[in-house]
Amino acid sequence: YFGKLESKLSVIRNLNDQVLFIDQGNRPLFEDMTDSDCRDNAPRTIFIISMYKDSQPRGMAVTISVKCEKISTLSCENKIISFKEMNPPDNIKDTKSDIIFFQRSVPGHDNKMQFESSSYEGYFLACEKERDLFKLILKKEDELGDRSIMFTVQNED
């Protein structure tokens, strides 16, 4: 069971300081941006992180959404990352959900965050380069200290 608490507006960056945004095709991508670029590209660079209380003491459960014309929420259904047109629900009556991730700080690096899928244990949001694009993907943690699964989250409230 997950019960929604509160939400905050955030900018999410990878460890190369690239900013996460949602492109015109609704794809979550990372791109180099100045602070003014980031502001100019809002609301596509501003993510709504909604926090949930979890019925199991596993960590801070969150959903990640974006509001452009409508609200879309990040999903890892079938281990594929996509934004689905939906509001973060008030309650989720299950112990796993494709839209719930556990946001945890990296041990020894309180400002660096990881997002583990509640549906797929050991799988994390990650940044991966594919041709000329830096994509947000779901990746199994295969090595300690993997920088691709670490992010910074800057509150914009």
């Epitope: 926090m51 209380k53 019925s55 960590g59 309650n91």
Partner: antibody
Framework: QVQLQQSGPRLVKPSQTLSLTCTVS??????????WSWIRQPAGKGLEWIGS???????YYNPSLKSRVTISGDTPKNQFSLKLSSVTAADTAVYYC?????????????????WGRGTLVTVSS | DIVMTQSPSTLSASVGDRVTITCRAS??????LAWYQQKPGRAPKVLIY???TLESGVPSRFSGSGSGTDFTLTISSLQPEDFATYYC?????????FGQGTKLEIK
């Protein structure tokens, strides 16, 4: 009403494993609705949650101690146990077992509502 | 982890006084906060959960308030048995974390 009774060695040598058991009376650890938890308190200091176990056997640990902690349950004996490996003097503390109401959308949850009396465990050679 | 900061660390008061202890969370925890009382050599005892709900059997002189990051525990009229150490605790997000404690002593 539910009562928790703790047992285990009060002196542990450095690098060894600290082991404590909590026996539950007046209720069953297998009935659901509660987590069964361990908390510790170094002398003159604050409280630290170590971890919890659910009736299903699922365990949840404080990340700061996770690599050294094992919590297990023994349903027939109505007991749950703590093992903390590779102890040092910094692990010297009063160790408490406690009951924790589980969260399923209700308010009365995730605090420690019934406690054992506590066991002072000293790590020393 | 969510850091809970209590103030003051020590509070001197007299029987009959109204006292307030404050607790601040390092990030918003909605109303998911508990208050515990601990006397020397004893296990802690829960007084309040969900920021303001009194646990069964706890005297009504204890009350809690707050939401988000700022919380208070108030004892409306101190009784001799209330001199103890009080802890706030984050019960929103694991790992469950406690404040460093406020020792309430006799003036």
């Amino acid at each position: 009403q539910v009562q928790l009774q703790q047992s285990g060695p009060r002196l542990v040598k450095p690098s060894q494993t600290l082991s404590l058991t909590c026996t539950v009376s007046g209720g069953s650890i297998s009935s659901g609705g509660y987590y069964w938890s361990w908390i510790r308190q170094p002398a003159g200091k604050g409280l630290e949650w170590i971890g919890s176990i659910y009736y299903s056997g699922s365990t949840y640990y404080n990340p700061s101690l996770k690599s050294r902690v094992t919590i297990s349950g023994d349903t027939p004996k109505n007991q749950f146990s703590l093992k903390l490996s590779s102890v040092t003097a910094a692990d010297t503390a009063v160790y408490y077992c406690a009951r924790t109401p589980a969260y399923f959308g209700q308010d009365r949850t995730d605090f420690f509502d019934v406690w054992g009396r506590g066991t002072l465990v000293t790590v020393s050679s | 982890d969510i850091v809970m900061t209590q103030s003051p660390s020590t509070l001197s008061a007299s029987v009959g006084d109204r006292v307030t202890i404050t607790c601040r969370a390092s990030q918003g925890i909605s109303s998911w906060l508990a208050w515990y009382q601990q006397k020397p050599g004893r296990a802690p005892k829960v007084l309040i959960y969900k920021a303001s709900t009194l646990e069964s059997g706890v005297p009504s002189r204890f009350s809690g308030s707050g939401s988000g990051t700022d919380f208070t525990l108030t004892i409306s009229s101190l009784q001799p048995e209330d001199f103890a150490t009080y802890y706030c605790a984050n019960i929103a997000f694991p790992p469950w974390t406690f404040g460093q404690g406020t020792k309430l002593e006799i003036k």
